[in-house]
């Protein structure tokens, strides 16, 4: 019996369209595949960021696959191809492996590149993203943003920059039809006269970054004699009720501080009969339904009732 | 004719262990491709794991990943899921089933009739 | 991951009707689908692989149709035993393995 043997694909590379992390693997068939005519050949795909400890694996029956990667590293990628048993009348033969890499060539020196990157998505509309100048760069240094996701046809420039003396510093986004539950690509680049600046690559989801606007409209009602409800509405905007947690921070008489998170829009709070006085704020924060992470917004306008008694009527600020 | 007999389900806290088996017969196990699929109460299908007829290729979806660990014995024609760290959300009927034609997974044309995992305290 | 979605989620027919049920992936994945049919208590069956092959067994007034990344399922006289949940499911790339998130068909 001679054993059956199957040759890797050809023609294997990454291949990057300029989407600033979104590249494209892609590959040939493999060499005298003409003794398989009757069988659908399939190929397992291993890649990650060169430093990553685990491989992303994947099979497919197509001659290419896509995927998200960090710029600011290298690639490596692995393929081979698979004949399952059908293929080969009695075992699974696999190729050796054929294999590539590709980096960007690093220009400058890392301590050029843009410092402190962040950026908020705010209230789910807003997208800014601001920055620090690289370290010792000199004042004629100037950074330029290019961001990508799916859905545009390619990369594009920040047109509004956030300036201090003279340098970029931060970004204004206009509005970002369907940006949100997919990855969102940044390259801050720079150029000096004086020396090479080094490249920075940044890929997040904006729903996971997002602060909203606090609540609005606090109010007491008084449900009891030791029980007075806490409302409060969810602040004006996209973002659905469904989608916010809250915190709430309540002060008895100047002492007793409660704090607390809730996922509706009340709080009942047991009080006694010697209350004077009652204050709270409610901070607003998307929830795991609607992102993996997010950011607390500022604090609502405090809420205070002073008194000899709270009032059954709602107290309205 | 081919069968496929899951066992192994039951009640389980959160953070426990279970070890689902499948018994295969009616057909040459070694050849194929194996996966397990789970349908939570009232819900739809999802992939949980594959195995390759060899038992040398095997692959999860995210969510179990790191907790769940498919294997197979081919000379007792016997598929396993090994499911650790266990979660609320892992409550499920889970079903085995045989890949018709492919290396790791395919379309199922033979499935088990399915072992209910309850996890809860 | 390939997103498969399906359309209508609920359906009501009569006997003798003709049903189609749509699915949808988010990328092309050229005519590597399934379609199963579910009744409830009961495991799924397989009714179509590779978009339009019948599997052995299954009534002839089953068929499938479309590639890349449209594709339908068909019952052309739908029978009283016909009444259950459909899925269809994408093995071009994985993991993971994904499936739709089903097509209940009910008595009108």
């Known amino acids: 019996d001679t054993e059956i043997k199957v040759n890797p694909p050809q023609d294997f590379e990454i291949v990057d369209p300029g989407y600033l992390g979104y590249l494209y693997l892609q590959w040939q068939p493999p060499l005298s595949l003409d003794h398989f005519k009757e069988c659908t050949v399939e190929y397992e795909l291993k890649y990650r960021n060169i430093g990553s400890e685990t491989w992303k694996t994947i099979i497919t029956k197509n001659l290419h696959y896509k995927d998200g990667f960090d710029l600011n590293k290298g690639i490596e990628a692995k393929i081979h191809t698979l004949l399952p048993w059908q293929c080969t009348n009695g075992s699974e033969v696999q190729s050796s492996w054929a294999e590539t890499t590709y980096w960007i060539s690093p220009q400058g020196i890392p301590e050029t590149k843009v410092q402190d990157m962040d950026c908020v998505y705010y209230n789910w509309q807003y997208l800014l993203c601001s920055w620090k100048p690289g370290i010792g760069v000199l004042l004629d240094t100037n950074y330029n943003l290019f961001y990508w996701y799916e859905g545009l046809d390619h990369a594009l420039q920040c047109v509004d920059y956030i300036k201090a003396d003279g340098q970029n510093i931060g970004c204004r986004f206009p509005y970002l039809e369907a940006s949100d539950y997919k990855d969102f690509y940044i390259c801050v680049n720079g150029s000096s006269e004086n020396k090479p600046i080094r490249s920075s690559y940044f890929t997040f989801q904006l729903q996971n970054i997002v602060k909203p606007l606090p609540p609005v409209y606090l109010t007491f009602t008084r449900e009891s004699s030791c029980e007075i409800k806490l409302k409060w509405s969810i602040p004006l905007g996209p973002i659905p009720a469904r989608c916010f947690d809250y915190e709430i921070e309540i002060r008895e008489d100047d002492t007793t501080l409660v704090t607390a998170t809730v996922e509706n829009e009340t709080y009942t709070l047991k009080t006694t009969n010697e209350t004077r006085q009652l204050c709270f704020v409610v901070r607003s924060k998307v929830n795991i339904y609607c992102s993996d992470d997010g950011i607390w917004s500022e604090w609502s306008d405090k809420q205070c009732w002073e008194g000899e008694d709270l009032s059954k009527k709602t107290l309205l600020r | 004719e081919v069968q496929l007999l899951e066992s192994g389900g039951g009640l389980v806290q959160p953070g426990g262990s279970l070890r689902l088996s499948c018994a295969a017969s009616?057909?040459?196990?070694?050849?194929?491709?194996m996966s397990w699929v789970r349908q939570a109460p009232g819900k739809g299908l999802e992939w949980v794991s594959a195995i390759s007829g060899s038992g040398g290729s095997t692959y999860y979806a995210d969510s179990v990943k790191g907790r769940f660990t498919i294997s197979r014995d081919n000379s007792k024609n016997t598929l396993y899921l090994q499911m650790n760290s266990l979660r609320a959300e892992d409550t499920a009927v889970y079903y085995c089933?045989?890949?018709?034609?492919?290396w790791g997974a395919g379309a199922f044309d033979y499935w088990g009739q399915g072992t209910l995992v309850t996890v809860s305290s | 991951d390939i997103q498969m979605t399906q359309s209508p989620s609920t359906l009501s027919a009569s006997v003798g009707d003709r049903v189609t049920i749509t699915c949808r992936a988010s990328q092309s994945i050229s005519s590597w689908l399934a379609w199963y049919q579910q009744k409830p208590g009961k495991a799924p069956k397989l009714l179509i692989y590779d978009a339009s092959s019948l599997e052995s067994g299954v009534p002839s007034r089953f068929s499938g149709s479309g590639s890349g990344t449209e594709f339908t399922l068909t019952i052309s006289s739908l029978q009283p035993d016909d009444f259950a949940t459909y899925y269809c499911q994408q093995y071009d790339t994985y993991p993971p393995i994904t499936f739709g998130q089903g097509t209940k068909v009910e008595i009108k």
């Open positions: 089933a045989k890949v018709r034609y492919g």
């Open positions: 009616g057909f040459t196990f070694s050849s194929y491709a």
